[in-house]
């Protein structure tokens, strides 16, 4: 039975040209995390595997940095980065947990008003 829950930052905004940290946290389970996938709806961004370490999708190599922890840092943000992001936790023995984050990339002046949604 899957007892765990994924906590995410929910909806966040960031400034065009800046960077943002995507973070999820799996709680309420003793299951072992074997792999975390970071994905958009139709694109794998990165994988953090317990044995293999981090693997960044080659097409995102220049704009994605691993961490902190199991999180993911997106850099040089563009308006096209606006959208849904998913953290997919592969665990044993529970199975797969999926968390959702919505990122809105804003022009500089607008983003300042949304700063409270950014992860510190």
């Amino acid at each position: 039975m899957m007892t765990g829950t994924i906590e995410t930052t929910g909806n966040i905004s960031a400034e065009k040209g800046g960077s943002i940290i995507l973070q999820c946290h799996l709680s309420s389970t003793t299951a072992q995390v074997t792999q975390v996938n970071w994905e958009q709806q139709d694109q794998l961004l990165a994988i953090c595997n317990a044995d293999l370490g981090w693997h960044i999708s080659p097409s995102f190599k220049d704009r994605v940095a691993p961490g902190p922890g199991l999180g993911l840092t997106l850099q040089s943000l563009t308006v096209n980065d606006t959208g849904e992001y998913f953290c997919i936790y592969h665990t044993y023995p529970d199975g797969t947990y999926t968390g959702r984050i919505f990122l809105e990339v804003l022009e500089s002046s607008v983003a300042e008003h949304g700063a409270r949604f950014q992860i510190p």
């Epitope: 074997t34 794998l44 595997n49 293999l52 080659p58 998913f86």
Partner: antibody, heavy 121, light 113 residues
Framework: QVQLQQPGAELVKPGASVKMSCKAS????????MHWVKQTPGRGLEWIGA????????SYNQKFKGKATLTADKSSSTAYMQLSSLTSEDSAVYYC??????????????WGAGTTVTVSA | DIVMTQSPDSLAVSLGERATINCKSS????????????LAWYQQKPGQPPKLLIY???TRESGVPDRFSGSGSGTDFTLTISSLQAEDVAVYYC?????????FGGGTKLEIK
């Protein structure tokens, strides 16, 4: 173009070890995971394990832990698999295969031609 | 480990006829959060390594003829060749692309009747 070059055959004696190579070209070696797959007529295709050439991290199928050791040499863009304490059960074709990112998926997109290992006294 | 079971083991189909290969996984390969199925199909001809045909259960690899199609979700999947050609004679494998260890079906040998 992407190529994975493997030696065609290895003949080894029971109890010995063999280290086979997989030389990659046509892409950035450290940006892609490299996997090894065993094929026998009886058991079909079996995933042995994978190596991340960038970090050196390895993941093994529990069945092949202690049998296979995966390494990679970044300077020559070559992945290696060593098989130890060989028996007739290890006679098989061994493939190296790269995983590429296809949308949300990590897929075996390029394969070596395979190395045929024959264990015989 | 996820066990992949293919049926039939072998199949003989007349040229121009439809060929259907089934694959069943012991655990769901669907991530319901993003509605993606982590299943791939490969074709292997004698003396060659496997070649990718389908990924994500239904997406054809670039260059694969449109007579090949994949369908299914969760634990039950199907590879269909709508009109068999002579060059389609091969062994076909499904593969769990969901979690390590990656596992393959036992293969289906497709021949011409």
């Amino acid at each position: 173009q992407v190529q994975l070059q493997q030696p065609g055959a290895e003949l080894v004696k029971p109890g010995a070890s063999v280290k086979m190579s997989c030389k990659a070209s046509g892409y950035a070696f450290t940006n892609y995971l490299m996997h090894w797959v065993k094929q026998t007529p009886g058991r079909g295709l079996e995933w042995i394990g994978a190596i991340n050439p960038g970090s050196g991290g390895t993941s093994y199928n529990q069945k092949f832990k202690g049998k296979a050791t995966l390494t990679a040499d970044k300077s020559s863009s070559t992945a290696y698999m060593q098989l130890s304490s060989l028996t007739s059960e290890d006679s098989a074709v061994y493939y190296c295969a790269r995983t590429g990112v296809y949308g949300n998926f990590l897929i075996f997109d390029y394969w070596g031609a395979g190395t045929t290992v024959t264990v015989s006294a | 480990d996820i066990v992949m079971t293919q049926s039939p083991d072998s199949l003989a189909v007349s040229l121009g006829e439809r060929a259907t290969i089934n694959c069943k996984s012991s655990q769901s390969l669907l991530n319901s959060g993003i509605q993606k199925n982590y299943l791939a199909w490969y074709q292997q001809k004698p003396g060659q390594p496997p070649k990718l045909l389908i990924y994500g259960a239904s997406t054809r690899e670039s260059g694969v003829p449109d007579r090949f199609s994949g369908s299914g979700s969760g634990t039950d999947f199907t590879l269909t060749i709508s009109s068999l050609q002579a060059e389609d004679v091969a062994v076909y494998y499904c593969q769990n692309d969901h979690r390590y260890p990656f596992t393959f079906g036992g293969g289906t040998k497709l021949e011409i009747k």
